[in-house]
Structures are given as structure tokens and as C-alpha cells.
Amino acid sequence: MMTGTIETTGNISAEKGGSIILQCHLSSTTAQVTQVNWEQQDQLLAICNADLGWHISPSFKDRVAPGPGLGLTLQSLTVNDTGEYFCIYHTYPDGTYTGRIFLEVLESSVAEHGARFQIP
């Protein structure tokens, strides 16, 4: 039975040219995390594997910094970065947990962080 929950940074906004931290946290389970995938819609951004470290997708290579922790820092934001992002936690023995973040990249200087929320 999957008991865990994923907490994410929720709906967030940031300015064009700036950077943003995409962050998820898996709680309420003793399952071992073996890998975390970061995806934008159906496109892979990065993988963090417990044994092999980080792999960054070539299309994002120049503007992604792994971290903080299992999170991802996306730099040099463009309006094309607006959209849904997913953290996919591969765990044993529970299986897969997925969290969703919506990022809006704004032209203006009015960019505020949304509240945190949980996905069971």
C-alpha cells in the first residue's frame, strides 16, 4: 500500500531571465527512493539516480543546476518555460510517486511565489 505523499512548491511564477527552484519532498513513507525524474510535460529535464548521480537532458544542459537536494534549479528562464513540471519519485517497495508544479514565467517584474500544497 502506498502511504507516501509528495509536497511540492505548487504554483509558482518567476521573471523572464531569472531562475527558479523546482522542489518536491516525499514524506509519510519509509520506502527507499532510488531515482527522481524531472519532466516538463513529456520532456525529460533531469534524472537523479541514487547510485549514478545526475544526468541532465542535453536540451536543458546549459541552464539547469542540480539541487537543492533532489530539486532542480532552472536558470535563464524564458516564456517558453511556462507550463507543468513533474517530479517522479521511484521508490522501493512502494513504486512511483508523482508531484506536479505549474510554473508561469512573466515578462513583468510582478512574480510571486504560490503556496505549497500536497498531492496524495
Epitope: 519532498h25 527512493v33 549514478l52 548521480g53 539547469v64 543546476a65 542540480p66 537536494g69 533532489l70 534549479t73
Partner: antibody, heavy 118, light 106 residues
């Protein structure tokens, strides 16, 4: 087994700069963040920043962004840190440390001692 | 930035005694990591992800906590446990360390 070998102690003049190295072995250098940490008796452990050698992207603590420059050479699996405009406040031991899964630093170099003389 | 406050700063314990030290965060973090450092040596990862023991760490050590309150416990103090212990978070930038708890043998 991962291993980090740092360069030797440095005695440098005030106002000069120093560049130290951290040679990694036993793992795929490009796949792990390399953090740099300053240790002084008065300030304990202070995070300077990190570099991801796979793409050279760096992140600095605000306190050190105009003081330290992090680089990495994947061909030799070596990370470097340059500290500029040295003052007595920069006298410390500097460690490189590999960023492990989840954000803990799982392997540390032996440290490079920097002494700034006036 | 997230400030980590360790207490006590210095403590001493007799062999066999239970030891608990704490690390309080100025805002909530998802995990805490702990390092052991002995004089003249590099820090060693000791406990990571709040409660996982690093390779080679004796089972008498344990870690626990959540939110803003975390602790490291030694069930039965031994001479080799004398060291300084630092907590560390990387929930967001900047990564921060606590000032350390120095544990001495009584």
C-alpha cells in the same frame, strides 16, 4: 570508492588571489555536484557554493559570489576554486565535498589551508 | 536563509551514557544531515536524510526529527564518539550548517 585530493597549503599576500584544486577519482566526476566549504575557528563551517561539472553551472552563497570563482575540468576530473582580493578574513581551511543523493556531502577532501599575510 | 541552531554548544558524557543533541531550524526543512568532525580532520557524513546512518557508523547512533526540530542520539557513549557534530540543511539556497556541538568524554 570516491576520493577527493586537494592541493597543498598556501601562504599568500594580502590583496593577491589563490587558486586551489580538488582532484576526484573513483566515480563519474560529471554526474555529481562539487561543493566548497570554508572552515574557520570563529565561523564554523560556511558554504561557499557548488559547481555541477556536467555543465559548469555554478551557484554561490551571496556572501561569496564576489569572492570565489568555481570551475571544473572534466578531462582531468578536477574542480578548482579561486579566491580573489585576499584579506585576513580569508585565512581558513577550504574543503571540497561531493554532493551525494539527497543533498548531503558524502565525500570530503582533506582540506587546503590558506594563510593570508599582510 | 535558514539558520540552524545547535544545542548544547559543548557537552560531556560518561561511557555508556545516552547522549542527545538537537538542531533547530529557523524555518521548516524536509531533511537534516549530520557530520562528525575530529580535530585536524575533514568532516565525515554521519547521518543523512534525517535518520539514515552513513556507511561504517555504529548502530548506537540514530537521527530523528521533522519540520524545524531535529536530533542526533547516541544510545551508549563511547570514547571514540568524542568529536564535534554539525547539522546541515539544503532545503533551499544557501545551504547552511549549524555551529556544531562539541561532545567530550567525561
Amino acid at each position: 570508492q570516491a576520493y577527493l585530493q586537494q592541493s597543498g597549503a598556501e601562504l599568500v599576500r594580502s590583496g593577491a588571489s589563490v587558486k586551489m584544486s580538488c582532484k576526484a577519482s573513483g566515480y563519474t566526476f560529471s554526474n555529481y555536484n562539487m561543493h566548497w566549504v570554508k572552515q574557520t575557528p570563529g565561523q564554523g563551517l560556511e558554504w561557499i557554493g557548488y559547481i555541477f561539472p556536467g555543465n559548469g553551472v555554478t551557484t554561490y552563497s551571496q556572501k561569496f559570489k564576489d569572492k570565489a570563482t568555481l570551475t571544473a575540468d572534466t578531462s582531468s576530473s578536477t574542480a578548482y576554486m579561486q579566491i580573489s582580493s585576499l584579506t585576513s578574513e580569508d585565512s581558513a581551511v577550504y574543503f571540497c565535498a561531493r554532493g551525494g543523493f539527497g543533498g548531503a556531502m558524502d565525500y570530503w577532501g582533506q582540506g587546503t589551508s590558506v594563510t593570508v599575510s599582510s | 536563509q535558514i539558520v540552524l541552531t545547535q544545542s548544547p554548544e559543548i557537552m560531556s558524557a560518561s561511557p555508556g551514557e545516552k547522549v542527545t543533541m538537537t538542531c533547530s531550524a529557523s524555518s521548516s526543512v524536509s531533511h537534516m544531515h549530520w557530520y562528525q568532525q575530529k580535530s585536524g580532520t575533514s568532516p565525515k557524513r554521519w547521518i543523512y536524510d534525517t535518520s539514515k546512518l552513513a556507511s561504517g557508523v555504529p548502530a548506537r547512533f540514530s537521527g530523528s526529527g521533522s519540520g524545524t526540530s531535529y536530533s542526533l542520539t547516541i544510545s551508549s557513549m563511547e570514547a571514540e564518539d568524542s568529536a564535534t557534530y554539525f547539522c546541515q540543511q539544503w532545503n533551499n539556497n544557501p545551504l547552511t550548517f549549524g555551529a556544531g556541538t562539541k561532545l567530550e568524554l567525561k
